[in-house]
Interface confidence: medium
């Protein structure tokens, strides 16, 4: 028996359902009584879901998995994972045994988009050219860790005095805080771009300082 899975990682948004595709080619006369199907975590070998002895043995993994029972006889051994969490990320092995066996692994990449960044300025009044200011760009509830870029009004990168911290919350999602320390020019725009590398999602925030007043 030959097992086939998608070579590309399956990307799933947090809280949505994901399908880990796996198929095999049943021989003529194939019956589900002959099928042993195991989904397991590749690294730890933890059982996720199984079908043996002619019946679905059910989910062994947080009761959030299901097979496609009507499609099994056609060789569709795909696994549905419901309400995806950050902790579900990783490699899953689809193991099919009829008389001989084969297995293949598929990767699940979990993702969550970052919120539109909020910008804060410190100090935020009585600013003059030459003052040192701290601009903070904050974006929330994304996954995986973000890439953060700062640019000036001409779109040129600001690489100097930048400190970025990313903290995971209880759901494993990241809150990003990036701090730029810069000496004010006569006027200028400071932009922050928070990029989700998996979703290729860019979230933009900017602050424009034109003497007085400031716009965000």
């Amino acid at each position: 028996v030959e097992v086939q899975v998608s070579e590309d990682p399956v990307v799933a948004l947090v809280d949505t359902d994901a399908t880990l595709r796996c198929s095999f080619s049943p021989e003529p006369g194939f019956s589900l009584r002959q099928l042993n199907l195991i989904w397991q975590l590749t690294d730890t070998k933890q059982l996720v879901h199984s079908f043996t002895e002619g019946r679905d043995q059910g989910s062994a993994y947080a009761n959030r998995t299901a097979l496609f029972p009507d499609l099994l006889v056609q060789g569709n051994a795909s696994l549905r994972l419901q309400r995806v969490r950050v902790t579900d990320e990783g490699s899953y092995t689809c193991f099919v045994s009829i008389q001989d066996f084969d297995s293949a692994a598929v990767s699940l990449q979990v993702a969550a988009p970052y919120s539109k960044p909020s910008m804060t300025l410190e100090p935020n009044k009585d600013l003059r050219p030459g003052d040192m200011v701290t601009i903070t760009c904050s974006s929330y509830q994304g996954y995986p860790e973000a890439e953060v870029f700062w640019k000036d009004g001409q779109g040129l990168p600001l690489t100097g005095n930048v400190t970025t911290s990313q903290m995971a919350n209880e759901r494993g999602l990241f809150d990003v805080h990036s701090v730029l320390r810069v000496v004010l020019g006569a006027n200028g725009t400071y932009s922050c771009l928070v990029r989700n590398p998996v979703l290729q999602q860019d979230a933009h925030g900017s602050v424009t300082i034109t003497g007085q007043p400031m716009t965000f």
Epitope: T93, Q99, D100
Partner: antibody, heavy 121, light 107 residues
Framework: QVQLVESGAEVKKPGSSVKVSCKAS????????ISWVRQAPGQGLEWMGR????????NYAQKFQGRVTITADKSTSTAYMELSSLRSEDTAVYYC??????????????WGQGTLITVSS | DIQMTQSPSTLSASVGDRVNITCRAS??????LAWYQQKPGKAPKLLIY???YLQTGVPSRFSGSGAGTEFTLTISSLQPDDFATYYC?????????FGGGTKVEIK
């Protein structure tokens, strides 16, 4: 390379039980089946049953149903075969065997060294 | 259970001979047949699986053929190391069964 190491030879009285262990190393234990095959002196091979450790499911040959129990301890990568109500015809070498990571639940690339169980009063 | 019948039960042959061992199943088993070699005091060794697939590391003088109910193990040129007992095993069903064995001895 999978290695299967069985417990030592035993002499048992008729009517008693015996439990043979089989410790696996060098490969994946939990996903693949461990079978037990016995061979009486000068006789052929006889399949007794198997366990798939990850599922905790065991299947037995009809002849041994009700008299044999196969279990597995994933934490120690060890499979066990217990045979009860022993009689003299159960005197045999008992092998554990599996297909390793590359073959099958049903054919056996790897075998233990065998455990001789002698049933005698 | 599926019965497996091997013939002959004993075969006398010389080094260099071509040897055929037959295995018959009591019902069709497709190609789900394996062959093993066993030497005295040792565990069996897998030679052929799925009727005709040579197990890794097994010399090419061993070959398997057949499907359905009739199967043959062939040793194209018998070597001194090949004197042993050979067993067929069906795995068409969950319940596995072996043939009674064929002892290949020196003529």
């Amino acid at each position: 390379q999978v290695q299967l190491v069985e417990s030592g030879a035993e002499v048992k009285k008729p009517g008693s039980s015996v439990k043979v262990s089989c410790k696996a190393s060098g490969g994946t234990f939990s996903s693949y089946a461990i079978s037990w095959v016995r061979q009486a002196p000068g006789q052929g091979l006889e399949w007794m049953g198997r366990i798939i450790p990850i599922l905790g499911i065991a299947n037995y040959a009809q002849k041994f149903q009700g008299r044999v129990t196969i279990t597995a301890d994933k934490s120690t990568s060890t499979a066990y075969m217990e045979l009860s109500s022993l009689r003299s015809e159960d005197t045999a070498v008992y092998y554990c065997a599996n297909g390793g990571d590359s073959s099958s639940w049903y054919t056996f690339d790897y075998w233990g060294q065998g455990t001789l169980i002698t049933v005698s009063s | 259970d599926i019965q497996m019948t091997q013939s002959p039960s004993t075969l006398s042959a010389s080094v260099g001979d071509r040897v055929n061992i037959t295995c018959r199943a009591s019902q069709t088993i497709n190609s789900w047949l394996a062959w093993y070699q066993q030497k005295p005091g040792k565990a069996p060794k897998l030679l052929i699986y799925k009727a005709s697939y040579l197990q890794t590391g097994v010399p090419s003088r061993f070959s398997g053929s057949g499907a359905g109910t009739e199967f043959t193990l062939t040793i194209s040129s018998l070597q001194p190391d090949d004197f042993a007992t050979y067993y067929c095993q069906q795995y068409n069903s969950y319940s596995l069964t072996f043939g009674g064995g064929t002892k290949v001895e020196i003529k």
